[in-house]
């Protein structure tokens, strides 16, 4: 599932290159392993911002699929309470390209620990 999430992120990156989206997104660029589920939640919430900003059906579908895949992969530990982690709003705001690069990085963390 996580490998498919990366494929979807690459697809989103390709799709948004043909658009002009100026959004800045809360981005965790240095994820601590003990906060990775919290960080993933922030990435997924911000991904919905991209979908709404784009107004593009392909991006919308890809974001939904990515969320479905991530949800299923995290169904066993998605409700784990991680303490001492930053709230989404406390994260640095970055452009979409940097956001997606950081997203791929956190997904790779999940792949490496699964």
């Amino acid at each position: 599932n996580w490998v498919n999430v990366i494929s979807d992120l690459k697809k989103i990156e390709d799709l948004i290159q043909s658009m002009h989206i100026d959004a800045t997104l809360y981005t965790e660029s240095d994820v601590h392993p003990s906060c990775k589920v919290t960080a993933m939640k922030c990435f997924l919430l911000e991904l919905q911002v991209i979908s709404l900003e784009s107004g593009d059906a392909s991006i919308h579908d890809t974001v939904e699929n990515l969320i479905i895949l991530a949800n299923n992969s995290l169904s066993s530990n998605g409700n784990v309470t991680e303490s001492g982690c930053k709230e989404c709003e406390e994260l640095e705001e970055k452009n979409i390209k940097e956001f997606l690069q950081s997203f791929v990085h956190i997904v790779q963390m999940f792949i490496n620990t699964s």
Partner: antibody, heavy 122, light 112 residues
Framework: EVRLMASGGGLVQPGGSLRLSCAAS????????MSWVRQAPGKGLEWVAT????????YYPDSVKGRFTISRDNSKNTLYLQMNSLRAEDTAVYYC???????????????WGQGTLVTVSS | DVVMTQSPLSLPVTLGQPASISCRSS???????????LEWYQQRPGQSPRLLIY???NRFSGVPDRFSGSGSGTDFTLKISRVEAEDVGVYYC?????????FGQGTKLEIK
């Protein structure tokens, strides 16, 4: 008023195939994901398949995966369910349903068609 | 897979009296983004299912306010404040937080 009209049901032998259709009207079909749900005689509801707005993504339970294929033709406002290798336990009324989008407020099947009966028997 | 268990399976109610249906999931259906995708559907005799409640407590348009949903995590409830004759049918809870999406077995509401 949203309208969904399922058709294509009938009697088919075990191992056979059938294609169901669902004609949609009174809404912008391409703006919604769609699902099929079935109900065996006298039994409860079972989710069968879901397809994304553009048709690129499909989802199934293990009970039908590899045998059933959901697809759509947005130019014809029509949803399909291709059912192969049919079994007696696939006998049911099949409903098509419109699925509200996650991005626009959460998932739910907000409108349902009237259903079409599929009977698998020799 | 998430198993949805409803109780009671049969619910005889006097007209004008309240009714309550419970739905329990085998694991939490709160998704990673903090949302709970739990719906309630009504199926009147001989009819197609109809959406009543989505995301635990949101009433769908046109649904009378005597219907209400509540709950969190793994325990959910559908309440009818005063049962009317048109409420007869089978009620299903449904989760679509995780694939495969799953229904409860259904609760048959009948008039005493």
């Amino acid at each position: 008023e949203v309208r969904l009209m399922a058709s294509g049901g009938g009697l088919v032998q075990p191992g056979g195939s059938l294609r169901l259709s669902c004609a949609a009207s009174e809404f912008t079909f391409s703006n919604y994901a769609m699902s099929w749900v079935r109900q065996a005689p006298g039994k409860g509801l079972e989710w069968v398949a879901t397809i994304s707005r553009g048709g690129d993504y499909t989802y199934y339970p293990d009970s039908v995966k590899g045998r059933f294929t959901i697809s759509r033709d947005n130019s014809k406002n029509t949803l399909y369910l291709q059912m192969n290798s049919l079994r007696a336990e696939d006998t049911a009324v099949y409903y098509c349903a419109r699925r509200v989008s996650l991005i626009t407020g959460g998932w739910a099947m907000d409108y349902w068609g009237q259903g079409t009966l599929v009977t698998v028997s020799s | 897979d998430v198993v949805m268990t409803q109780s009671p399976l049969s619910l005889p109610v006097t007209l004008g009296q309240p009714a309550s249906i419970s739905c329990r999931s085998s694991q939490s259906i709160v998704d990673i983004t903090g949302n709970t995708y739990l719906e309630w559907y009504q199926q009147r005799p001989g009819q197609s299912p109809r959406l009543l409640i989505y995301k635990v407590f949101n009433r769908f348009s046109g649904v009378p306010d005597r219907f209400s949903g509540s709950g969190s995590g793994t325990d959910f409830t559908l309440k009818i404040s005063r049962v009317e004759a048109e409420d007869v049918g089978v009620y299903y809870c449904f989760q679509d937080s995780f694939v495969p999406y799953t229904f409860g077995q259904g609760t048959k509401l009948e008039i005493k």
